[in-house]
């Protein structure tokens, strides 16, 4: 039902939902004080626009009584009790912050009047792409899945001169969420990866994968997983590994391998490592700096998310626009606005454009190294590294499949 | 409009050094690599060497490695070769070229000419 | 490293002729990648990934091959064509260059 919105009158609220179940474990306090920090920006910079506007928060909490399983399995209905409570108490703001689990997200998209723009941090699932007032600042699986696409297609590089159409991937059910819907969206016969690759297998079993490391009749050389080193060390341990077999770690929120006194593991030196390009200001600032690492880009996105409220909102009041209009509910996609670390880009559907840096272990220094960086917004390669120092043999990512010849 | 300017042409004495600067405009110096070349009087192009701007990783042709040293200045939008131990055989003209893969070497600088005599 | 042997080295023709460039590479590469450059001046991308056209580039030029054989081609040479043509290979590390083809006028 359609529920009036504290949006107008030079008063302007954002809702944020704080649910019990969210993508990453992280303190709702935590998740305030990056809200709270957002506001104090926007603030400024609306004041400093000749815009004399009050803007605030009110978060809405889930009583926790029925969905606390702490994470996103039992969210599909969360969102929608919370959507509820916002109505019965009548206190919508102008956009909608939160939720992050697909499940949820999902489930309010479908069932509910969408007349206001709802920003997530997380929904990473590809049921949740190509939602009109949907947005999403924390890349969804179909980014991954397209530089994926793209890596795999590649054979005009010193380092990588095969083109790859197989794949095998490690999916034991245990994943974060959004590693979940990451293989989620590789598994799916229906996508866009799947329609790519003449073979892909899902490994469900620790052994599965343990056994494809030096299996000689194994179906492809590339083995796709999700997590951070020590998951895959779990898994691998100190096992031997065939000289051609290239594991491409998909971690995406993470900024460790960036800090100066990393150095890598040994069982990483077969690993590509997909990661986001880290920010610039993020590991000093004020609210990230109890954080994790992963934390540190879920809170972001939470701060990112009240940042673009008042980019919007500006423009808007600048133009002298309604703000409770379908018009303002779809404009929160294909801009660029100034995020807290940056400028953040969201493509036509209103997902977050990004970075990806891949890289790889070198074996002289040990250290983890950039090979090359892929903009998502642009579909594109830039290499970094033209002669890494790579375990493989003649310094080249091999074949896909062995045995089989130049290409 | 992508412009590599290089510095001007030097004449120099068998052992010194120079460096030669090659400043970018039209595009994000960072967004790509950058490369040098040789081209000796009659001689075939020769591939010196590669820099990232952003990462600062730098990769040298072998034959290179100890004349060239490849540096840049991103808030100038600037990269820099110095050679060292001037000989003879290095009389050249020193190209820098950007890197736009998937077309490499999409843009050259106008050339830096050196001249190595006694 | 891959070596780049083109031939011939010198060609001459005239206006509205048909050149063919040759580039054989000592081992198999993917691609193959093509320079103009006139007296004077750097060269200039232009024709990469063995058949692409450089922007502004005219379409009587091609570019196409596979393995260690790849050539370029004019399809009606013009007065502003005349120019020594390089290719290049980054199929290995280090990128290398072929001797160059001067295209000259008869």
């Known amino acids: 039902s359609q529920v009036s919105q504290n949006c107008h009158n030079g008063s302007y609220e954002i809702s944020v939902l704080m649910m019990g179940n969210s993508a990453f474990a992280e303190p709702l306090k935590n998740l305030e004080d990056a809200v709270n920090e957002g506001l104090e920006i926007v603030r400024g910079r609306l004041q400093n626009a000749g815009l004399n506007v009050t803007v605030n928060a009110t978060f809405m909490y889930s009583d926790g009584l029925i969905h606390n399983s702490g994470d996103c399995r039992s969210s599909t209905c969360e969102g929608l009790d919370l959507l509820r409570k916002i109505s019965n108490a009548q206190r919508m703001g102008c956009v909608l912050i939160g939720p992050s689990c697909t499940y949820s997200t999902f489930q309010m998209y479908l069932d509910t009047e969408l007349s206001y723009p709802m920003i997530s941090a997380g929904s990473f699932g590809l049921s949740c792409d190509y939602k009109e007032t949907l947005t999403r600042l924390m890349s969804p699986a179909r980014k991954l899945m397209y530089f994926l696409v793209n890596f795999w297609k590649t054979n005009d590089l010193p380092f990588k001169t095969y083109s790859w159409s197989t794949s095998y991937v490690y999916k034991n059910g245990t994943e974060t969420e959004d590693c979940f819907w990451y293989l989620n969206a590789l598994e799916a016969s229906v996508s866009y990866f799947s329609h790519e690759l003449g073979f892909k297998v899902v490994l469900r079993q620790d052994k599965e994968f343990q056994d494809i490391l030096m299996d000689h009749n194994r179906k492809s050389n590339v083995i796709i997983m999700c997590g951070g080193p020590e998951f895959l060390y779990k898994l691998k341990g100190d096992r031997a590994v065939a000289e051609d077999i290239v594991i491409i770690l998909v971690d995406l929120f993470n900024d460790q391998y960036f800090e100066d006194n990393v150095t890598a593991p040994d069982y990483m030196k077969n690993v590509l490592v997909l990661t986001l390009s880290p920010g610039n200001s993020l590991l000093n600032s004020s609210f990230s700096r109890n954080l994790s690492p992963t934390k540190r880009d879920f809170a972001l996105a939470y701060l990112n998310g009240i940042l673009l409220f008042g980019h919007m909102l500006k423009i808007f009041l600048e133009n002298g626009e309604n703000i409770t209009t379908p018009k303002f509910a779809h404009a929160f996609r294909n801009l660029t606005f100034e995020g807290y670390d940056g400028p953040v880009t969201l493509d036509d559907w209103g997902d977050v454009d990004s970075t990806m840096v891949l890289l790889y272990t070198s074996v002289d220094t040990k250290k983890y190294k950039v090979l090359l960086t892929y903009d998502t917004h642009v579909n594109k390669t830039y290499p970094v590294d033209m002669s890494p120092t790579f375990t493989w043999k003649n310094s080249k990512l091999p074949n896909d499949i062995t045995g089989r010849g130049p290409q | 409009e992508v412009q590599l300017v290089q510095s001007g042409a030097e004449v120099k004495k068998p052992g010194a050094s120079v460096k030669v600067s090659c400043k970018a405009s039209?595009?994000?110096?960072?967004?790509?690599?950058m490369n040098w070349v040789k081209q000796a009087p009659g001689q075939r192009l020769e591939w010196m060497g590669v820099?990232?701007?952003?990462?600062?990783?730098?990769n040298y042709n072998q034959k290179f490695k100890d004349k060239a040293t490849i540096t840049r200045d991103t808030s100038a939008s600037t990269a820099y070769m110095e050679l060292s131990s001037l000989r003879s055989e290095d009389t050249a003209v020193y190209y820098c070229?950007?890197?736009?893969?998937?077309?490499?070497?999409?843009?050259w600088g106008q050339g830096t000419t050196v001249t190595v005599s006694s | 490293d891959i070596q780049l042997t083109q031939s011939p080295s010198f060609l001459s023709a005239s206006p509205g002729d048909r050149v063919t460039i040759t580039c054989s590479a000592s081992?198999?590469?993917?691609?193959m990648y093509w320079y103009q450059q006139k007296p004077g001046s750097s060269p200039k991308s232009w024709i990469y990934?063995?058949?692409n056209l450089a922007q502004g580039v005219p379409s009587r030029f091609s570019g196409s091959g596979s393995g260690t054989e790849y050539t370029l081609t004019i399809s009606s040479l013009q007065p502003e064509d005349f120019a020594t043509y390089y290719c290049?290979?980054?199929?290995?590390?280090?990128?290398?260059f072929g001797g160059g083809t001067k295209v000259e006028i008869k």
């Open positions: 070229a950007r890197d736009n893969y998937p077309n490499y070497f999409d843009y």
């Open positions: 039209g595009y994000t110096f960072t967004d790509h690599n």
């Open positions: 820099m990232n701007p952003k990462f600062g990783t730098i």
């Open positions: 081992s198999s590469v993917n691609y």
């Open positions: 990934r063995t058949s």
């Open positions: 290049q290979q980054y199929h290995d590390y280090p990128p290398t």
